[in-house]
């Protein structure tokens, strides 16, 4: 049975640049050599979130008893293929990408749930899922048709941190303003009542006749 792709020991690529020219892409995808083919399915289109996060499922039809699987995400744009990220995992274990990778993922049976983060509009492109059954033999290789990921940058708006600083400054200003206003008002009131004196309460007759039987206390200062 022929295989789509290449055997890694036969055509070890120099990934220093991590970019493959179009001719190599053709070789990678269409020349049948050295391994068994495997079907890989992935969604046709995915829209990234406003935070630049895109998730999709990569499912492979495992023909053998794989215990070690390698998953690679390739990005095809402008006739070039770039390796986005790659991870090798043991069946039943978690998928672990490098610490600096923009990818995260989980595996469940023959499914790999991939998440790519930090995407911007310029990262829009076809993201191809490549699955290799590394161990035990035989070596299987499967390449998906790709998931077109659309990334739309959100409308430019002020930085949220900057807004918080403005809000904090305005709040602080208002607080100190009200504090000063209160202090000034109190000081003025106290000035009107000075010098401080002592006094006595006396009962005075009411001015209104209908209130004859009621007496209102009134404060009279005594010098």
């Amino acid at each position: 049975m022929a295989c789509l792709g290449f055997q890694r020991h036969k055509a070890q690529l120099n990934l220093a640049t991590r970019t493959w020219p179009c001719t190599l892409l053709f070789f990678l995808l269409f020349i049948p050599v050295f391994c068994k083919a495997m079907h890989v399915a992935q969604p046709a289109v995915v829209l990234a979130s406003s935070r630049g996060i895109a998730s999709f499922v990569c499912e492979y039809a495992s023909p053998g008893k794989a215990t070690e699987v390698r998953v690679t995400v390739l990005r095809q744009a402008d006739s070039q293929v770039t390796e986005v990220c790659a991870a090798t995992y043991m069946m039943g274990n978690e998928l672990t990408f490098l610490d600096d990778s923009i990818c995260t993922g989980t595996s469940s049976g023959n499914q790999v749930n991939l998440t790519i983060q930090g995407l911007r509009a310029m990262d829009t492109g076809l993201y191809i899922c490549k699955v290799e059954l590394m161990y035990p033999p035989p070596y299987y290789l499967g390449i998906g048709n790709g998931t077109q990921i659309y990334v739309i940058d959100p409308e430019p708006c002020p930085d949220s941190d900057f807004l918080l600083w403005i809000l904090a400054a305005v709040s602080s200003g208002l607080f100190f303003y009200s504090f000063l206003l209160t202090a000034v008002s109190l000081s003025k009131m106290l000035k009107k009542r000075s010098p401080l004196t002592t006094g006595v309460y006396v009962k005075m007759p009411p001015t209104e006749p209908e209130c004859e039987k009621q007496f209102q206390p009134y404060f009279i200062p005594i010098n």
Epitope: Q7, R8, H9, K36, M134, Y135, P136
Partner: antibody, heavy 120, light 107 residues
């Protein structure tokens, strides 16, 4: 140093069962598939099957599906081959062999073999 | 299952001779083939893997070639220690079958 150690010889009666062992050392036992190969006197090599010790997943040659049982004890790094309902046809040398993880693949380490003699 | 047809089954040769052993699988192996040497009372020893790759510690007089359904093991100049039985094996899906062997004897 990778080593696969097997018992030298086993004598068994027809109709009984025999369980032979392969003690692995010098590598991570649970990450390699272990194979068993049969060789009758003066004959060629026959692949019996293989086991992945971490989860005891096995792949058996259909010619041995009712005859062989593969097991593994991960704590002791030992792989076992059990042959049941023994007949004279089962008299042979049985080898354990590890599959290398490098592609292209091959059996990179072999045990020295266990001679099973079925005789009444 | 893939059948491995190895020929000849036995071969007589002298020290210094060039010897060729062939292995023909029943289907394309895409070079996923290994060659082993076995001496009496010993376990098989790997000679070549991936049809053409020489295993560590194996003398350069051993070489492998072939692709598809036709593979060859060549010993360029036979040495006394080379008289043994040789097996080809595929690892192109289970069962991993072996050829029936070629017994190389001293003429």
């Amino acid at each position: 140093e990778v080593q696969l150690l097997q018992a030298g010889a086993v004598l068994a009666r027809p109709g009984t069962s025999v369980k032979i062992s392969c003690k692995a050392s010098g590598y991570s036992f649970t990450t390699y598939w272990m194979n068993w190969v049969k060789q009758r006197p003066g004959k060629g090599l026959e692949w019996i099957g293989m086991i992945h010790p971490s989860d005891s997943e096995t792949s058996l040659n259909q010619a041995f599906k009712d005859k062989a049982k593969l097991t593994a004890a991960t704590s002791a790094s030992i792989a076992y081959l059990e042959f049941s309902s023994l007949t004279n046809e089962d008299s042979a040398v049985y080898y354990c062999a590890r599959i290398g993880r490098r592609n292209p693949y091959y059996f990179d380490y072999w045990g020295q073999g266990t001679l099973v003699t079925v005789s009444s | 299952d893939i059948q491995m047809t190895q020929s000849p089954s036995s071969l007589s040769a002298s020290v210094g001779d060039r010897v060729t052993i062939t292995c023909r699988p029943s289907e394309n192996l895409y070079t996923n083939l290994a060659w082993y040497q076995q001496k009496p009372g010993k376990a098989p020893k790997l000679l070549l893997y991936g049809a053409t790759n020489l295993a560590d510690g194996v003398p350069s007089r051993f070489s492998g070639s072939g692709s598809g359904t036709d593979y060859t093991l060549t010993i360029s100049s036979l040495q006394p220690e080379d008289f043994a039985t040789y097996y080809c094996q595929h690892l192109w899906g289970t069962p991993f079958t072996f050829g029936q062997g070629t017994k190389l004897e001293i003429k």
